[in-house]
Interface confidence: low
């Protein structure tokens, strides 16, 4: 399991004649926000086709309005990264598409007008856990600048995310700072570990302890914009260290707008922005249909007359969820018998047995006690997948082997004394105690 | 993209009768009846009102309290037409008649909530004289 982390770092009209000067006119203000597609391999799929490995729709980047005569400036761009988690391994080679959507927010009746201004695809070779990748790709007259990168969520790690590194219990044959790796259990993981306190979002390192920033972003720890004002915001009281304003509560905080929507401040209220597929004034009412493909994996797409939901996605074999985007977590239906662990390795299911027991779900119990003698006429007890020896009289350790002091435990109440003997111990009792035990 | 187009307004009467008609284009005929519509009116000087609402899939409907038991709306899905029959009309239900469109099911107790729909006509009129 991981994530494939997309950051877009311009969009604009590329070099040379008959560059558009801007998506947006003084007539019609818009905003920008982009989606991108994830597929495995390195197919030339068509854009409709499901994106097997996720798809995420970033936010809206702030509205931005052309001024006649003034020279086209950067775009605004959404903030933050757009995330696709994928839960199974990495394939190392996939195909993307990047699309540009405009958010026309003009005064026509019902609500902003999308349009799709630009779509980059391209096919890549990407190891997870590597640093960030940079790309420039153009369409048409625009020019989009991003990074990419892919990276293993815990326990994971490797360039596919299928090693799963956790401590053991035996002693490690690492070297200090490495954690012992399961499957491979003579293999050591180094974290790479970023400077502590580095910008998740808008730094990487490739070395440990580095923190290196992406376009836009500086400071050590690559949290400042590279041209912001030393201000935040107009609202809220003003702060003694600063002399900036501190922003106080608003309408937006705690994101009112669901499914993704974006919240903006309104002079008096807010207003939500919502992604393609659903609209309401929190974005809580979804209008997407089968028109739209919402159907990952290869599900059927049938018009719901469930009256919650208008349409419904038959989901094929292994995956599961309203949009068929989930893999079924085969592993959560326990298959592994007898304390089996079960991994789930997308073609396949496996199931690593405990000690004691064998077969594809570990169903078979083995004879713990074949070909196990216990010494000294002890005998041998089933169960629990580790054989155990009952142990004859004066006799203890795992086989019987080792000879026992019976006088060790001092079994002998209220200070009678313990003599060892070949049938067993015997207690001297104490002046007014009696029993074999002494305790009465 | 979905169009829609409203036709069937006009000057009427008080206690007379329309049928006020709603073509979408631009959108499959084999999923129209996904489309959530709803008709609004709006008069001169005051804010645009729903009147009467069919949701997706269920197509169940929804009326505002003044029009009910006068207007009855239906869906031609053959046609792709949305329907507005209007009985006993009323001096005050002259306005500009809207038809508006989602791409979704609406809960039909919000179906006249006009910033849930994503597409909207250019309307008729609609006069009503005593």
């Known amino acids: 399991a991981g994530v494939f982390e997309l950051q877009i770092h311009s969009f604009g009209p590329g070099p040379g004649p008959g560059a558009p000067r801007s998506p947006c006119s003084a007539r019609l203000p818009c905003r920008l926000f982009f989606r991108v597609c994830l597929k495995p391999g390195l197919s030339e799929e068509a854009a409709e086709s499901p994106c097997a490995l996720g798809a995420a729709l970033s936010a809206r980047g702030p509205v931005y309005t052309e001024q006649p005569g003034a020279p086209a400036p950067d775009l605004p761009l959404p903030d933050g990264l757009l995330q696709v988690p994928f839960r199974d391994a990495w394939p190392g080679t996939f195909s993307f598409i990047i699309e540009t959507w405009r958010e026309e927010l003009g005064d026509q009746i019902g609500g902003p007008a999308w349009s799709l201004l630009a779509r980059v695809a391209g096919r890549r070779r990407l190891a997870a856990g590597g640093p960030w990748a940079r790309d420039i790709q153009r369409a048409g007259a625009w020019e989009l600048r991003f990074s990419y990168r892919a990276r293993c969520e815990p326990p994971a790690v490797g360039t596919a995310c299928t090693r799963l590194c956790r401590p053991r219990s035996a002693p490690s044959r690492c070297g200090p700072g490495l954690r012992p790796c399961a499957p491979l259990e003579d293999e050591c993981e180094a974290p790479l570990v970023c400077r502590a306190g580095c910008s998740p979002e808008h730094g990487f390192c490739e070395q440990p302890g580095e923190c290196r920033c992406l376009e836009g972003w500086t400071g050590p720890l690559c949290t400042v914009p590279v041209s912001t004002s030393s201000c935040l915001s107009p609202r809220g009281p003003s702060s003694a260290t600063t002399g900036c304003l501190v922003p106080g509560p608003g309408p937006c905080d705690g994101n009112p707008c669901a499914n993704g929507g974006s919240c903006s401040e309104t002079p008096r209220s807010f207003e939500c922005t919502c992604p393609r597929g659903f609209y309401g004034l929190r974005c809580e009412v979804s209008g997407v249909t089968c028109a739209d493909g919402p159907c990952f994996n290869g599900g059927l797409c049938v018009g719901g007359a469930d009256p919650d939901s208008a349409y419904i996605c038959h989901c094929p074999p292994g995956f599961q969820g309203s949009n068929c985007e989930k893999r079924v977590d085969r592993c959560s239906l326990q298959p592994c018998r007898n304390g089996g662990l079960c991994l789930d390795l997308g073609h396949a299911l496996r199931c690593r047995c405990r000690a004691g027991f064998a077969g594809p779900r570990c169903e078979h119990d083995l004879d713990d006690c074949a070909g196990r003698a216990c010494a000294n006429g002890g005998t041998c007890v089933e169960g629990g997948g580790a054989h155990r020896c009952s142990c004859a009289l004066g006799f203890g350790g795992r086989d019987c082997r080792e000879r026992a002091d019976p006088c060790a435990a001092r079994p002998c109440a209220h200070g009678g004394r313990c003599y060892a003997h070949f049938s067993g111990l015997v207690c001297a009792c104490a002046p007014g105690y009696m029993g074999a035990r002494c305790e009465f | 993209q979905v169009q829609l187009a409203e036709s069937g307004g006009g000057s009427v009467q008080a206690g007379g009768s329309l049928r006020l008609s709603c073509v979408a284009s631009?959108?499959?005929?084999?999923?129209?009846?996904?489309?959530?519509m709803a008709w609004f009116r709006q008069a001169p000087g005051k804010e645009r009102e729903g009147v009467a609402a069919?949701?997706?899939?269920?197509?169940?409907?929804s009326y505002a309290d003044s029009v009910k038991d006068r207007f009855t709306i239906s869906k031609d899905y053959a046609n792709n037409t949305l329907y507005l029959h209007i009985n006993n009309l009323k001096p005050e239900d002259t306005a500009m008649y809207y038809c508006?469109?989602?791409?979704?099911?609406?809960?039909?107790?919000?179906?006249?909530?006009?910033?849930?729909?994503?597409?909207w006509g250019q309307g008729t009129q609609v006069t009503v004289s005593s």
């Open positions: 508006a469109a989602a791409s979704g099911w609406i809960v039909p107790s919000r179906s006249l909530t006009a910033n849930l729909y994503r597409y």
């Open positions: 069919i949701t997706s899939g269920t197509g169940s409907t």
């Open positions: 631009g959108y499959p005929s084999s999923t129209y009846y996904m489309l959530s």
